[in-house]
Every structure is written in C-alpha cells, then in structure tokens.
C-alpha cells in the first residue's frame, strides 16, 4: 500500500495529502547511501547516520537496506518514491510508521529491506519478529 | 563545501512581520527542494514551507495564509516572509535541502 493519495500535478510536482487531506510535507529520512555496519544479530539497531535530510518530493519515504556477505556488513539509508522499484523491489511497507526488516532473496548474500513513512523512521531498523504484522498473534491483538 | 545560513530573526509584536532569508553556498537552490522548518522552545521540529524545485509550494495548516516561501535564484537565496505573526511563532528556524544540508537556524521571538 502507498501512504498518501496523490491528489494532483503542478508544474510537474506532485501534490501529496495524508489520510486526513491534509497537504504532506516531504518525509525527512536518515539520508548516509551506503555504509559499513556493525549490526548483526540483533532484534533492532540504529542506523548511526548523521545525516538527517528532507526528500526531494513528497511522495518519497524512508528506505532502510542492510546487507551482509563474506566480506562485509552494510546499512543503506536513503529517500525513495515507493511507485518505483528499489533494489528490483516493490516497496510494500512504505505505509508502516516504523522499518520493519523482510527478508529478500538476493544470490551471495542476506539481504533485508524496510519502508517507512514517519520522520527519521529509518534511523531505527527492526528485525524482530514480533513487530512483523504476518504474526497471527499480533493481528489478533491489534483487531480485538 | 555547502552551506546555507538564515538571517532575519528577531523580537518582533505580536501583529508584526519578519523577513527570514536563507543564503546558499556550495549548491544551486534553484534546482533543489528547499524547506524551512522550526523548533518552539522545548517542542518537536515541525514543517512550515516548503518550495519544490518545480515551484510548488506546501505550507502547515498553522502559517497557511501569514508565511510566504519564495526564492531568487539570482542570489541563491530562499525567503520567508512572516505576517500577523502570533507569540506561538516563537521558535529557532531553520532551511534546509536535500541531501542532508541545514542551516544553524535564526531565533525568531513574537511577544
């Protein structure tokens, strides 16, 4: 699901409204491209990125990737538009108020990603399973 | 090495204007996105303009109608323009553009 609802273009710009019609501003998102990481095997991490920056449009969200091999471990931080791929993937979180790692399937590597619409929101990854809504449980918690 | 610096701040009336300037080195606005944000004292960052490289302006709910984003792309440089200011317009304002460039920010005080 995308977030907002594009309402109209100006000047080629697009007008973004939140849920309750009001005008969006652009999403500020941890912005450090691609570093080197130190986490790993933990239930959630911050991303250690300095560099907090205002996207470009404001149908852009907060993209998190992190990424480990034989060699290495690395953390991506960026703003994406959720209409368009990302890694060759769709971004199916781009909702969520939090960044909820899933698993992709990437050749040579273990490869998570999350999406998140709320400020900063990837400056705190999440790996955990208890966060992930395909929980049974949690559905149940979050509808009674 | 970018930077952008605000200017304009002040103690100003309620019922009074500022004009807040942001000066950019190092980048070219005018193909940017650039937004002006601010902190009331002991409050979180909040959005108040925003002017889209295509001249597409957003304004918060609680400016729309009193601030005015605009730019000259001849001094590099964004405006915001405050009318009817009000006591809760008191806070530090900063610009700010992608990719991760802020200003040090300009106290702006409305008693």
């Known amino acids: 699901t995308i977030p907002p609802h594009v309402q109209k273009s100006v000047n080629n710009d697009m007008i973004v409204t939140d849920n309750n019609g009001a005008v969006k501003f652009p999403q500020l998102c941890k912005f450090c491209d691609v570093r080197f990481s130190t986490c790993d095997n933990q239930k959630s991490c911050m991303s250690n990125c300095s560099i907090t920056s205002i996207c470009e449009k404001p149908q852009e969200v907060c993209v998190a990737v992190w990424r480990k091999n034989d060699e290495n471990i690395t953390l991506e931080t960026v703003c994406h538009d959720p209409k368009l791929p990302y890694h060759d993937f769709i971004l199916e979180d781009a909702a969520s108020p939090k960044c909820i790692m899933k698993e992709k399937k990437k050749p040579g590597e273990t490869f998570f990603m999350c999406s998140c619409s709320s400020d900063e929101c990837n400056d705190n990854i999440i790996f955990s399973e208890e966060y992930n809504t395909s929980n049974p449980d949690l559905l149940l918690v979050i509808f009674q | 090495q970018v930077q952008l610096q605000e200017s304009g701040g002040g103690l100003v009336q309620a019922g009074g204007s500022l004009r807040l300037s942001c000066a950019a080195s190092?980048?070219?606005?005018?193909?940017?996105?650039v937004a002006w944000y601010r902190q009331p004292p002991g409050k979180q960052r909040e959005g108040v303009a925003h002017?889209?490289?295509?001249?597409?302006?957003i304004y918060a709910d609680s400016v729309k109608g009193r601030f005015t984003i605009s730019r000259d792309n001849s001094k590099n440089t964004v405006y915001l323009e405050m009318n009817s200011l009000k006591p809760e317009d008191t806070a530090v304002y900063y610009c700010?553009?992608?990719?991760?460039?802020w200003g040090q920010g300009t106290q702006v005080t409305v008693s």
């Open positions: 700010t553009a992608p990719v991760g460039y």
């Open positions: 190092g980048i070219d606005l005018s193909t940017k996105s």
């Open positions: 002017s889209s490289s295509g001249g597409t302006t």
